[in-house]
């Protein structure tokens, strides 16, 4: 099921449903409730990239 | 090299407007939310407004709604903030900052990592 | 809205000192908390986001901890460079809201 983009003016009129699937270069943001642009981490030792987990200590890659 | 020029502030009286623009480099503003902060003298940082450019969404702090308006030209890479009706309290520095997310198990987790330098806004009679 | 209530205000500190600085909402906002630092004159510089990750290019004697309503920043060992003041922020709920910043300042 897509992201659902109401086209609604203020972010407040909307509801806050549970977050909705986004695509694969994408994430949900709460603030704005809907899927945006989302970056990957690295670990700094190997340089692998992964989704961030709970509890990690993992840095964000520099720039975009 | 990802970056951030705001541009428009002034002098201006009570009652009056300007737009100040946020010309962004080194990242498409599409893919972000962007967000204008304002710093008063010798004061906290503010919140104002977002935009997200890809669907049009907005918000506002309600110390603004009505009064300002936030928009973003995706062909120019730009976020703007028209102010209107201006009050002596709306004095301050304004920044725009890029939101950037990283991803934690589908859920954004970021915060306002890029910032313009600031301009100035002063209403006074 | 949510408030965001920050202490201390301003706090007096050494060169080598650890400093603690916290920050407590006024509902649950999950982990949605960033850490700010300031210098005067200067935009604000991203240090800690999602209440506990440090930010790329920030120095590790900073970091975050908490979950819920609240939340701390510590600085391990006070360096020169660290004299600014310091803003939390939620982004879990529209409207986004700071802290009132916490200043600190050389002994």
């Known amino acids: 099921m897509g992201a659902r983009r109401l086209r609604v003016r203020s972010q407040r009129s909307r509801d806050s449903s549970v977050p909705t699937q986004c695509n694969q270069t994408e994430c949900f943001d709460p603030l704005v409730r809907n899927c945006v642009s989302c970056e990957l981490f690295h670990t700094p030792d190997t340089g692998h990239t992964s989704s961030l987990e709970p509890g990690t200590a993992l840095q964000p890659q520099e720039g975009s | 090299e990802v970056q951030l020029v705001e541009s428009g502030g002034g002098l201006v009286q009570p009652g009056g407007s300007l737009r100040l623009s946020c010309a962004a480099s080194?990242?498409?503003?599409?893919?972000?939310?962007i967000h204008w902060v304002r710093q008063a003298p010798g004061k906290g940082l503010e919140w104002v407004a977002w935009?997200?450019?890809?669907?049009?969404?907005?918000d506002y702090a309600d110390s603004v709604k009505g009064r300002f308006t936030i928009s973003a030209d995706t062909s120019k890479n730009t976020a703007y903030l028209q102010m209107n009706s201006l009050r002596a309290e709306d004095t301050a520095v304004y920044y725009c900052?890029?939101?950037?997310?990283?991803?934690?198990?589908?859920?954004?987790?970021?915060?306002?990592?890029?910032w313009g330098q600031g301009t100035l806004v002063t209403v006074s009679s | 809205d949510i408030q965001m209530t920050q202490s201390p205000s301003s706090l007096s500190a050494s060169v080598g000192d650890r400093v603690t600085i916290t920050c407590r909402a006024s509902?649950?906002?999950?982990?949605?908390v960033a850490w700010y630092q300031q210098k005067p004159g200067k935009a604000p510089k991203l240090l800690i986001f999602?209440?506990?990750f440090l930010y790329s290019g920030v120095p590790s004697r900073f970091s975050g901890s908490g979950s819920g309503t609240d939340f701390t920043l510590t600085i391990s060992s006070l360096q020169p460079e660290d004299f600014a003041t310091y803003y939390c922020?939620?982004?879990?709920?529209?409207?986004?809201?700071f802290g009132q910043g916490t200043k600190v300042e050389i002994k």
């Open positions: 922020q939620q982004s879990q709920i529209s409207p986004p809201t």
């Open positions: 509902q649950d906002v999950a982990t949605a």
């Open positions: 935009v997200l450019p890809s669907v049009g969404f907005t």
């Open positions: 999602a209440a506990s």
């Open positions: 080194g990242f498409t503003i599409s893919s972000s939310s």
């Open positions: 900052a890029r939101r950037v997310c990283y991803n934690r198990l589908g859920v954004c987790a970021g915060g306002m990592d890029y």
